[in-house]
């Protein structure tokens, strides 16, 4: 006569987190009398998942009616699966007794849980950096399973190659995390640029998750200065302009100095934006030449985004009859601020 066999037909079952897992088990005989129990793991530390005889197992339901007279199907469904449920499940037949004794075990079914990675979070450097500098961006995503995952970096759609990625932990775990650091060389045109971290995983069905960082939060483009003398507006008056070009971010303070003495300080307000996201600004200074007997050194001093000031000077000759000494060749529209100095 054939002895009872416990059949677990599935070697492995893979389930998405949040779904229900069905673990199949049938027995070939009703002999001996005694309950079926399900365990996660083997050995003395195994965890009881379901006992046909007694106990309360709120997440477990029997697939077929376990009280049915000739029932030999002891498959179970475990609801609301989480990565913590991963492991090998054994269907075990016990023989009635005091206590019940283990009679025969199935071969086991390995349950793997497919858990989606969290939305990648990209973070850049704490301080702004200027073009030509290399900055690091980090990307993190957590809680995924299985461990296999693909991470790519892009800058404005172009794939980056200079990055390092780690998946933790190295050994077996219920879920995993990924951490990647990419190096990006900044250019003056990067105000509108984006760095993208893209994560692909089996749970995402070909639709990867993306995290982005705007380089506008990272880059500082220092201004270029040009001081020019405009044509005479009136007798004894000269108009000097300081063109502040291609700067980012907008935070900027300009100071005019006459022969080293502060003449006026102003904050950039009505700026114009270039296509590349940088800003231009222009400040005017109206100088009354008749008030000066010697030549005047005019200095435009700019403090940008809390950085050390940069300046550009222009020598105004008062001995010569005022004439045009320079012209504005900038193609951009410019804002204006006008002050008269007497």
């Amino acid at each position: 006569e054939e002895e009872l066999q416990v059949i677990q037909p599935d070697k492995s079952v893979s389930v998405a987190a949040g779904e229900s897992a069905i673990l199949h088990c049938t027995v070939t005989s009703l002999i001996p009398v005694g309950p079926i129990q399900w365990f996660r793991g083997a050995g003395p530390a195994r965890e009881l998942i379901y006992n046909q005889k007694e106990g309360h197992f709120p997440r477990v339901t029997t697939v077929s009616e376990s009280t049915k007279r000739e029932n030999m199907d002891f498959s179970i469904s475990i609801s609301n699966i989480t990565p913590a449920d991963a492991g090998t499940y054994y269907c075990v037949k016990f023989r009635k007794g005091s206590p019940d004794t283990e009679f025969k075990s199935g071969a086991g079914t390995e349950l793997s849980v497919r858990a989606k990675p969290s939305a990648p979070v990209v973070s850049g450097p704490a301080a702004r950096a200027t073009p030509q500098h290399t900055v690091s961006f980090t990307c993190e995503s957590h809680g995924f399973s299985p461990r296999d995952i693909t991470l790519k970096w892009f800058k404005n759609g172009n794939e980056l190659s200079d990055f390092q990625t780690n998946v933790d932990p190295v050994g077996e775990s219920v879920s995993y995390s990924i951490h990647s650091t990419a190096k990006v060389v900044l250019t003056r045109e990067d105000v509108h640029s984006q760095v993208i971290c893209e994560v692909a995983h089996v749970t995402l069905q070909g639709d990867p998750l993306r995290g982005t960082a705007n380089l506008s939060e990272t880059i500082r483009v220092p201004p270029t200065l040009e001081v020019t003398q405009q044509p005479v507006r009136a007798e004894n008056q000269v108009n000097v302009t300081c063109q502040v070009r291609k700067f980012y971010p907008q935070r900027l303070q300009l100071t005019w100095l006459e022969n080293g003495n502060v003449s006026r300080t102003e904050t950039a307000s009505t700026v114009t934006e270039n296509k590349d996201g940088t800003y231009n600004w222009m400040s005017w200074l109206l100088v009354n030449v008749s008030a000066h007997r010697d030549d005047v050194k005019l200095t435009c001093q700019v403090e940008h985004d809390g950085q050390p000031a940069v300046s550009k000077s222009h020598d105004l000759k008062v001995s010569a009859h005022p004439k045009e000494q320079g012209s504005n060749t900038a193609a951009e529209n410019t804002g204006s601020n006008e002050r008269n100095i007497y």
Epitope: E1, S29, I31, K96, G97
Partner: antibody
């Protein structure tokens, strides 16, 4: 699906008897067969269950004198050292109890122990 | 060994009556539910009515129901029918697989 007993009859005290229980409509391979007896005018009394070779068990009072066996189609109950108080109708039933109750019963066979 | 005590040993009732028979075990039955009820008519083999304390066997009318757990169990016939006049036995199982004992029976007679 039915069970049919045979082998009952008159036997002298101290004698032996083998009862048969033939199954039709199902195989006994995956089922236990239990034996129950009922003395005239009395209640039901559980004797034991025959599962497989390893899994055979008897009520404490029946151990030693009663032995069961079965094939895929027939179960047997061997009774020895019979006494007058063993006089009863003997039933075989499919099942081992608990979640495998006695759902199909034979018609019973009368065993009379008398000199 | 487990001892099953049925009460009453006999009762008289009329068709349409609600009938209740109790069975008490000397110790908790196996799994708190190893209790079956059988019906036996004169000259016939017993018939399974209820198992696992409350599960109705196939083909048994729904007027029969079982309840209870541990040591105290009840068989209820909600509306007695003429064919229900018979003797009813409970069968309780202890923790040992051979420890199966019938109650002494309850005879339901026509009033």
């Amino acid at each position: 699906r039915q069970l049919v007993e045979s082998g009952g009859g008159l036997v002298q005290p101290g004698g032996s008897l083998r009862l048969s229980c033939a199954a039709s409509g199902f195989s006994l391979s995956s089922h236990g067969i239990s034996w129950v007896r009922q003395a005239p005018g009395k209640g039901l009394e559980y004797i034991g269950t025959i599962g497989t070779g390893v899994i055979t068990y008897y009520a404490s009072w029946a151990k030693g004198r009663f032995t069961g066996s079965k094939t895929s189609s027939t179960a047997y109950l061997q009774m020895t050292s019979l006494r007058a108080e063993d006089t009863a109708v003997y039933y075989c039933a499919r099942g081992s109890a608990w979640n495998d109750p006695f759902d199909y019963w034979g018609q019973g066979t009368l065993v009379t122990v008398s000199s | 060994d487990i001892v099953m005590t049925q009460s009453p040993s006999s009762l008289s009732a009329s068709v349409g009556d609600r009938v209740t028979i109790t069975c008490q075990a000397s110790q908790s039955v196996y799994g708190n539910n190893d209790l079956a009820w059988y019906q036996q008519k004169p000259g016939q083999a017993p018939k399974l009515l209820i198992y696992l304390a409350s599960t109705l066997a196939t083909g048994v009318p729904s007027r029969f129901s079982g309840s209870g757990s541990g040591t105290d169990f009840t068989l209820t016939i909600s509306s007695l029918q003429p064919e229900d006049f018979a003797t009813y036995y409970c069968l309780g199982g202890g923790d040992d697989e051979a420890d199966n004992t019938f109650g002494q029976g309850t005879k339901v007679e026509i009033k």
